[in-house]
């Protein structure tokens, strides 16, 4: 019986060039978290495994940092980073819980309004 729920930051926005923390939290269950995947629909960004530690995909190595906790910090944001991110909690004995975060990366205010002299 899966009693847990995933709480996420929901829809978030950040400026191009900046950074953002993707964070999920599993509550209402005593199940043991054994692995957390961070994924987009078409690719894996990172895995935090209880035994193996962190694995960051080579595609994101330069701009993804593990943490805080089981979260993920995405740096040097580009507009191409806009989209949906999934936190996938592997637990024992419950099974898998999935949360989602929609990130919108905005052009910086300088880029939007032009340089002012």
């Amino acid at each position: 019986m899966m009693t847990g729920t995933i709480e996420t930051t929901g829809n978030i926005s950040a400026e191009k060039g900046g950074s953002i923390i993707l964070q999920c939290h599993l509550s209402s269950t005593t199940a043991q978290v054994t692995q957390v995947n961070w994924e987009q629909q078409d690719q894996l960004l990172a895995i935090c495994n209880a035994d193996l530690g962190w694995h960051i995909s080579p595609s994101f190595k330069d701009r993804v940092a593990p943490g805080p906790g089981l979260g993920l910090t995405l740096q040097s944001l580009t507009v191409n980073d806009t989209g949906e991110y999934f936190c996938i909690y592997h637990t024992y004995p419950d099974g898998t819980y999935t949360g989602r975060i929609f990130l919108e990366v905005l052009e910086s205010s300088v880029a939007e309004h032009g340089a002012r002299f």
């Epitope: 692995q35 995947n37 994924e39 629909q41 078409d42 690719q43 894996l44 895995i47 495994n49 193996l52 694995h55 995909s57 595609s59 949906e84 999934f86 996938i88 592997h90 898998t96 999935t98």
Partner: antibody, heavy 118, light 107 residues
Amino acid sequence: DVQLQESGPGLVKPSQTLSLTCTVTGYSITSDYAWNWIRQPPGKGLEWMGYISYSGSARYNPSLKSRITISRDTSKNQFSLKLSSVTAEDTATYYCARKGYPAYFAYWGQGTLVTVSS
Amino acid sequence: DIQMTQSPSSLSASVGDRVSITCKASQDVSTAVAWYQQKPGQAPRLLIYSASYRYTGVPDRFSGSGSGTDFTLTISSLQAEDVAVYYCQHHYSTPYTFGQGTKLEIK
């Protein structure tokens, strides 16, 4: 329970376009997940062809990219495969499947055999 | 593309035997590997995902292990109904690719 069912012609002539539809029952294709096509030539292994996500964005196997289109009809809860300029090499059993989180395939149609022959 | 290479391509074992099938990825995929069982005339059935997590309803004689590039599917005590072709698949990034399959028969 989620069920997927492929339908379409079992015989297609070389150079023509193969068209298949997957009808999903028990789950709305606009609610979540990505909806995939996977094929298996007779006596051979499995090849992922592509998907359309619940939000409508598609992703294709680069080996097929110039020939493949996956679309959907949300009113009928169906998604479709079109593969153009087919040859005998495209003879296969075609499966539709739902991709989970992570990207495993837990739900499959029963498959439909398409033969490319004149 | 990430290639998945399975071995052996076929194997024969007796009921009650412990059987292992291996899969090697062409690059590090961490734990992003799934295993499927396919019986003649049927669609594949998911057994294991994320290298070692048994899918709902899969008997506990099936287990998966490995990380990085080397993965193993083990059947602890082979049953007659386990005769099938077994496939590994990486779920690291698109395009998802499968191993060529291992045909398992009963001696």
